[in-house]
Structure formats: C-alpha cells, structure tokens
C-alpha cells in the first residue's frame, strides 16, 4: 500500500490556446486530470488500472502551481494504491480549459482539451522528487513525482506491513525495509523476550522484563547461580541442589556433627596436645606439670614424693628442693652418714649391715616403704588403674578416675560405646576392641548409617532432553534443572520457536 | 491440532470467587510463542477480554477487572486458571480460554468451547 | 478506556459484498483482528494483523485498516456466512473487542 505523488510546479500557454489552437475565451482556465496505469510500452488510452484524480481550475494560461499539501492535499496530487509498487508506471496528464463551473468529463466538449502529455518508466519507492518537464508546440508542463509508501508499509515495493508495538506481544519499531528493531531489553523474532540481567545463569535464571533476574528451583542469588544446599545443612556447601557436602571437620547427613573438637572448642588448656577421638570425642595429653581430662590441673612436683629418707619437699618454681634430715644429703636425700647403730628404720622396720658397716638397709614391715620405712605405702604406686586412669589417693584408701570409655574399679571396663545410640536410622550398633561398628538398614550407609541410599528419585531418569537430575533427600522427590530451550518439571516440553513472519 | 478445555464449577454463590481451569492438549504451553488469555460473554452480550499470561508466569490484566482478577500458570500440567473474586450477578458468562500467538499479533487462533457460569444464592 | 465502535447489524444478499466496519482512535497504527460468532458456538478467528487470513479461511473474508477504521469484507457472502463479527485490537497491554456486528 502506497501513493504515487505528483506535484505540479508551472504550466505555460503564452498564447492561450487550446490543442486545436483556438483560443480561449477570455483566457484558457486550467486544471488537469491524471492517469495512473500500469506500465505500456507505448501508452494508450483504457482503464487508469492505478487511479485517477483531478484538479481544480489551478490558474489562466500560464501560471506557477502552489504547493497546496497543507490546505487539503491537491498539490501533490495523490493517487494511492493498495498493492505492491510494481517499480513501473505509465502516467498520462492532461490539461483542461474549463468554461464553466462543471469539470466533470461529460460536462465539457471534446475540444477544451488544451495540451495531453504520456510518459512512462521505472519509480522505485522513495523520498526523492523525480522532476520532469514536457514541452509540446504551445505549451510547457514543469512536474515532478514520487512513490512513497502508505503509513505502516515498508520495503522496497510498500508490501511489508510492520507496525510499531511496545506491549507483551512485540517491542519494537520498524525499521526502513519493515523489518523489526527491537527496543532495548528486549530481543526474540517479534522482540518479545526480555534481555535477562547481565550474567543471569542460562539454565538456572529466567526473566519476565528486562534487567531480572528470576532463579529455578535450586538456585538462588543474585545470577542464579549459587545452588540450595539441602534444607537443614548446617556446616555443608552443595555444587548441586539440594546437596549437602561436609566442611573440614564436619559429619552427618546435615554436617551437624563436630568431627574436628579440638579445632571447633580447643578444650585441651595449659599448652597440651589435643587428638580427636571420634564424634564430640578427644584426647589432652598434657605437658608436664599438668594433670585433668582437660589438663587444666597444675601438678605439684612434690607429689610424686621425690625426697628419700624422711626428706621433706619444697615447691620451686623451677622444681623442688629436698631438705634431708640428719644423716642424710643428696639431692634426694638418697645418701646417708648413718649405720644400724643409729637405728634408721622406723615403724618398726629392721635393719642389716651393708658393705663392712658403711651403709645399711631396712627392711619394712607391711604398709610401709621408702628407705627408712618412713613412708606408709602409696597405693598408687603400683599404677593400678588400667586404660590410663588416674590413680588418686583418698586416705586408707584409693580410687581411679577413668578416661572417657571406661569404667569399674580399676577402669578395667570397657564402656559400651553403642550405649549412646551411636547408629542413626535405627541402625543395629556392635561393640568392637576398638570402637563399634553399625549394620545399616536398607537404605542407608556410613559409618553411622547418616547417609541416605534410599529411594534415589533419580535412578528412573525421569527427566527428559539431557536435564540434570537432583534428589531432594527431605522428599525423596526429584527436581530437572532444564537444558537451554527445554521447561516443564521433567524438562519434557521444548521452548517453541515463533513461526517466521508471514509477509 | 491444539485444544483448550474450560472446567469449573457452573454455579457461583455471589461474593464468592469464580475458579476455573483451561486444559491445553496438543502443545505445549511452554512456549514463548503464545499467551493464554481468558474472555467472557454475557448472555446475549458481546466478548470482553479478562486477561492473558505466558508459560513463565507474566500477567496482564483488563483494567476493569484488575483489582478481582488472578491468572495463574501450571507448566508441569499444562494448564492455566482464572479466578475471580467478590463475583456479583454480573459476572454471569460464557467464560473462554484462548491460545493467543505473537505471530498473528496477538490474535486468538485457538479457544475453548466455554463453560458457562452462572453467579446466584 | 479505548473503545471499539460497530454498526449493531448489517444487511447483504446471498453472492454479494458485506463490509462490516469497526471505528477507533488512530486504529489504523493497530493490528485489528475479526471474529466470526455463530450461535451457541466459539469465536473463529478470521482476519489477523488488518489483512491476512488463517489458513481454512475461505478468499472471500478480506480486511483493511487505515485512518480511524479497520473494515472487514465479505466477498459474495454465503448464507453460512451468517453470524456475529467481532472486531479486536490491543491498546497497550489490554485486549479489546469491538461492541459486534450482526451479519443477515
């Protein structure tokens, strides 16, 4: 659709005359009629295939034509069309003299024609003004002439409709051959999708207008493209959805359970040594000077008794210093001066002579000891508690303090580790030498039965067009993450393709 | 060949809400291609567009109906409703629904049968 | 709001022309769909972007759009083509229908 535009610029009779060379009377009142046809090679009179219009009486003789497109559009005169611009024409114009007010055809006779003038081409469709001008005996016609499309039809022959669009179902403008431009944001074949944020994960984010940033299920942030961690994951990261692996140190199917004590709560006080023992489980090995399960006990150095012979010990703070009774030196009071003659051993000990009377040594009754049986015995001497537990002496009497796992009188027992239900999931727990070991339901696996083997949502391949199957372990359910192009929840329906324009 | 199917109850109670769902078989209505919109006719009256969405959740709505209107997509069934709340006797209609394409900018090329509701005590 | 205007009926006889017309603001800058309602039945769509036809569309539906009217012809008009026509553009992001036309 389009309209061919001519603009009539002068006419010239100088004599007044009519194509019969009669003259008019008083002078020749003008106007014209065109003819706009398809293209003959030699133009003949028939049907204006294109249109026709007519003008108005536009002046007398000889006159200039004003361009008159504000006042009612008559220059240029408009012929339009409702078809695709063949590029060829055939245009007949002919000029009138008008005795009266009637400038129909019947109405005036055969021989007002004052001049008719044929011409035929090429026109592409165009801005540009072709000028023209066509001289015959008695007059002169200055012209010129355009095809331009009509509004809304583009391309080289006006067939292309586009019309600019900025709701749901394009955002666009059209450009010079009818194609469309989209606006910015937006992009598609009818520029119908929106430009997602900038970085916006491809499989895992989606938009409904520009600049967004909408995340799938299992992804969040602000591209999409960190992954949901199981829900409940505690000390865990995913690289997956719904996943839950374990930091350093950490355990369980929600990496709830502290593998790494000593680093998480470093417990072990006064510079000791600290070993992990199992789940919220270590070991203090304490630097000397230091006694307690947490080595937070100051050892005295003076109770392990150092001094011999009746000596009494000293604290120093860089040791003890034995102070010997008389008789006896050394730096544990372990020499003596003395002889059976002196009578040494007490509580009743009995002594004998040693080397010709140079020295002696007493033999003590029982609950006694130490080298003048001054010492009642230390019943914790003869390190009677097992497993590293800590003999303490209480009067008449003694008693062990155990390490964690043991028991009795002398820790002598081992303390059932499955007494703590160790095996999660209703797991079946044995006591081993060294620990326990869990037998696992159907279902479910590790050392403790934490990790979930049950009904993987996954195994059946239920999702569809090469899509990433997740297992939501809290709903044994699955989730598709979706290759590019693909939706649905098994990714089972392809994003279609508009279908081409349909010019 | 694609079908549309409106199902819903046919009788409404006023200043209830109007719940219907359209069922598309034949596509898939995941695809950027399309919008899937909801007309209604008044007995003996002319059609009035209620509103559309497309399969990632975007809506549009008649300006007249804004503030009463919830159109809402389900991909994994393939299907999308309509509900209208606060219904008076005025809302009694043939309700529609319409697969609209972008290709024939925005002509509805397919549509329900359509289900009449009638809103009364 | 924007509003779609048609004649409430139109008159033709059998095998000849019926131009149905539908008036609005500038609807010329619009693509203007027309559907065929016959009765007890769904709409048809008939004309899509001013002019062009769904394929099953018989030659005789013919549109055009220009000014402030969109004009749908019917082309020696059949009996079957008897029906409601409804004229439908967007304004903005909002879908309208034209009030109907009666074909007899």
């Known amino acids: 659709s389009g309209v061919f535009q001519l603009q009539l610029q002068e006419f010239i009779n100088e004599r007044g005359v009519l194509a019969s060379g009669r003259p008019c009377e008083p002078g020749c009142r003008t106007f014209f009629r065109v003819c706009l046809k398809h293209f003959q090679a030699v133009v003949s009179p028939g049907p204006c295939t294109f249109g026709t219009v007519s003008t108005p009486v536009l002046g007398t003789n000889s006159f200039a034509v004003r361009d008159d497109s504000s006042g009612g559009g008559r220059n240029p005169l408009q012929l339009p069309f409702n078809f695709t611009w063949p590029g060829t024409f055939s245009l007949i114009i002919e000029a009138w003299h008008a005795p009266g007010d009637d400038l129909r055809p019947e109405a005036l006779p055969p021989d007002a024609l004052i001049s008719k003038i044929a011409i035929q081409g090429s026109l592409a469709v165009g801005q540009n003004w072709l000028l023209d001008e066509q001289t015959s005996t008695l007059t002169r016609l200055r012209y010129s002439y355009r095809v331009i499309c009509s509004d809304n039809y583009y391309g080289d022959n006006c067939s292309r409709l586009c019309k600019k669009r900025n709701d749901h179902f394009g955002h666009y403008v059209c450009q010079p051959d009818g194609n469309l431009s989209c606006l910015p944001g937006w992009t598609g074949e009818y520029c119908q999708q929106p430009i997602c944020l900038s970085g916006c994960h491809e499989q895992n984010g989606y938009c409904s207008k520009p600049a967004e940033c909408l995340c799938r299920p299992g992804w969040q942030g602000r591209l999409c493209n960190e992954c949901i961690p199981h829900n409940g994951c505690r000390h865990g990261t995913c690289s997956t959805p719904w996943q839950c692996t374990c930091d350093e140190g950490w355990g369980g199917l929600f990496c709830d359970q502290d593998l790494n004590y000593c680093t998480h709560h470093s417990p072990c006080k006064n510079g000791a040594t600290c070993s992990n023992s199992g789940q919220r489980s270590y070991t203090c090995t304490c630097r000397p000077g230091y006694t307690g399960v947490d080595c937070e006990l100051e050892l005295s150095e003076c109770d392990s008794n150092p001094c011999r012979n009746g000596g009494s010990c000293k604290d120093q703070e860089d040791g003890y210093h034995c102070l010997c009774p008389p008789g006896y030196y050394g730096l544990h009071c372990e020499h003596s001066t003395l002889s059976c003659a002196d009578s040494p051993c007490f509580n009743g000990g009995s002594c004998r002579e040693r080397n010709q009377g140079a020295n002696y040594a007493c033999e003590c009754p029982p609950n006694f000891t130490g080298s003048n049986c001054e010492k009642k015995v230390d019943r914790c001497t003869s390190n009677p508690c097992a497993n590293g537990g800590q003999c303490l002496n209480r009067g008449p009497s003694r008693m062990c303090r155990c390490r964690p796992g043991f028991t009795g009188t002398y820790c002598e027992l081992h303390v059932s580790d499955c007494a703590r239900n160790p095996c999660a999931h209703g797991g079946t727990c044995h006591d081993l030498e060294n620990g326990l070991m869990c037998t696992c339901p159907a279902g479910f696996s590790g050392r403790r039965c934490e990790v979930r083997t049950s009904i993987d949502a996954c195994a059946s391949s239920p999702c569809f067009n090469r899509a990433t199957c997740y297992t939501d372990l809290s709903t044994d359910t699955f989730v598709c993450n979706c290759p590019y192009g693909f939706v649905g929840s098994r990714c089972e329906f392809p994003v279609g393709l508009p279908p081409s324009f349909p010019w | 060949e694609v079908q549309l199917q409106e199902s819903g109850p046919g009788l409404v109670k006023p200043s209830e809400t109007l719940s219907l769902t359209c069922t598309v078989s034949g596509g898939s209505i995941s695809s950027s291609s399309y919008y899937w919109g909801w007309i209604r006719q008044p007995p003996g009256k002319g059609l009035e567009w209620i509103g559309d969405?497309?399969?990632?959740?975007?809506?549009y709505y008649n300006p007249s109906l804004k503030n009463r209107v919830t159109i809402s997509v389900d991909t994994s069934k393939n299907q999308f409703s309509l509900k209208l709340s606060s219904v008076t006797a005025a809302d009694t209609a043939v309700y529609y629904c319409?697969?609209?394409?972008?290709?024939?900018?925005?002509?509805?090329?397919?549509w329900g049968q359509g289900t009449l509701v009638t809103v009364s005590s | 709001s924007y509003e779609l205007t048609q004649p409430p009926s139109v008159s033709v006889s059998p095998g000849q022309t019926a131009s149905i017309t539908c008036s609005g603001d500038?609807?010329?800058?619009?693509?203007v769909s027309w559907y065929q309602q016959k009765p007890g039945q769904s709409p048809v769509l008939v004309i899509y972007e001013d002019t062009n036809r769904p394929s099953g569309i018989p030659e005789r539906f013919s549109g055009s759009n220009s000014g402030d009217t969109a004009t749908l012809t019917i082309s020696g008009t059949q009996a079957m083509d008897e029906a409601d026509y409804y004229c439908q553009a967007w304004d903005s992001e909002t879908g309208v229908f034209g009030s109907g036309t009666k074909v007899t």
């Open positions: 500038m609807l010329g800058d619009k693509y």
């Open positions: 969405i497309n399969y990632a959740g975007s809506t």
């Open positions: 319409a697969r609209e394409a972008v290709a024939l900018g925005g002509g509805a090329d397919s």
